[in-house]
């Protein structure tokens, strides 16, 4: 089942080597798995990682570094992802998505 996330489309410009923080606003009662995707022009969306709310754990996709992508919940209503040490190849649209099973 797909769930709505109250995402706000934002444009962020950062210098190479800096960090960026993205917030995913969760709909009331969102549970299950919250996924982060990166969509770059001319490519299929790529899942980076997902957060398992049942076990409060993060599962990284292969080739994804825990030092590069840092996910944490600042409140029960949002999940944040910090992208560190930005390079040009990090450019793209980042999405969060959730479903219950």
């Amino acid at each position: 089942k797909s769930s709505n996330l109250e995402g706000r489309t934002k444009s962020v410009i950062r210098q190479t080597g800096s960090s960026a923080e993205i917030t995913c606003d969760l709909a009331e009662g969102s549970t299950g798995y919250i996924h982060w995707y990166l969509h770059q022009e001319g490519k299929a969306p790529q899942r980076l990682l997902y957060y398992d709310s049942y076990t409060s754990s993060v599962v990284l996709e292969s080739g994804i570094s825990p030092g590069k992508y840092d996910t944490y919940g600042s409140t029960r209503k949002n999940l944040r992802m910090i992208l560190r040490n930005l390079i040009e190849n990090d450019s793209g649209v980042y999405y969060c998505a959730t479903w219950d099973g």
Partner: antibody, heavy 120, light 107 residues
Framework: QVQLVESGGGLVQPGGSLRLSCAAS????????MSWVRQAPGKGLEWVST????????YYADSVKGRFTISRDNSKNTLYLQMNSLRAEDTAVYYC?????????????WGRGTLVTVSS | DIQMTQSPSSLSASVGDRVTITCQAS??????LNWYQQKPGKAPKLLIY???SLQSGVPSRFSVSGSGTDFTLTISNLQPEDFATYYC?????????FGQGTKVEIK
């Protein structure tokens, strides 16, 4: 320069607990994921656990999951490893290491290590 | 979990020799491979990251090749300070795993 100094090791009985610390200096601690890697006497290296820079995400080897807890205090530039229900096979030198912030991960540098001995 | 297999487990060589250590992953890890050097009683030290990038300060006599599942670390013109144990490590997927190590001893 980057410096990592572990402490808290020692002799503990099976089933006991120990808390390791790693004091970091010379870099912006909260920006980096940090890891613990161990080495049993005369053996190879085994990754134990990693915590993200914010402390919000943790990862564990199956061999320690449910028994060890990694954490950090970014205000004190300190990494911790709480080890409970210790077993003889946990006997090792425990190293803390700084992770990269690149797309691919690596450990650099490493602390000198602290020896944990689990024996009755 | 991804298994990392190093060979040989040990080797004897002389100063000036060319030494080759191989590391094989149980599945494709692209270029997500690192190499460490460890001397007795010391902490490991990063030599090479991302399969082919030499860490700052590492001499050019260390070279690497390979991608996917098979990787090679070569030390040309072996120096006294190179006698140590070398470990490969994959950073493609958690749990991060290391090879069992290759000890380079003086002949």
């Amino acid at each position: 320069q980057v410096q990592l100094v572990e402490s808290g090791g020692g002799l503990v009985q099976p089933g006991g607990s120990l808390r390791l610390s790693c004091a970091a200096s010379g870099f912006t601690f909260s920006t980096y994921a940090m890891s613990w890697v161990r080495q049993a006497p005369g053996k190879g290296l085994e990754w134990v656990s990693t915590v993200s820079g914010s402390g919000g995400t943790t990862y564990y080897a199956d061999s320690v999951k449910g028994r060890f807890t990694i954490s950090r205090d970014n205000s004190k530039n300190t990494l911790y490893l709480q080890m409970n229900s210790l077993r003889a096979e946990d006997t090792a030198v425990y190293y803390c290491a700084k992770d990269s912030t690149a797309v691919t991960d690596w450990f650099d540098p490493w602390g000198r290590g602290t020896l944990v001995t689990v024996s009755s | 979990d991804i298994q990392m297999t190093q060979s040989p487990s040990s080797l004897s060589a002389s100063v000036g020799d060319r030494v080759t250590i191989t590391c094989q992953a149980s599945q494709d890890i692209s270029n997500y491979l690192n190499w460490y050097q460890q001397k007795p009683g010391k902490a490991p030290k990063l030599l090479i990251y991302a399969a082919s990038s030499l860490q700052s300060g590492v001499p050019s006599r260390f070279s690497v090749s390979g991608s996917g599942t098979d990787f090679t670390l070569t030390i040309s013109n072996l120096q006294p300070e190179d006698f140590a144990t070398y470990y490969c490590q994959q950073s493609y997927s958690i749990p991060w795993t290391f090879g069992q190590g290759t000890k380079v001893e003086i002949k």
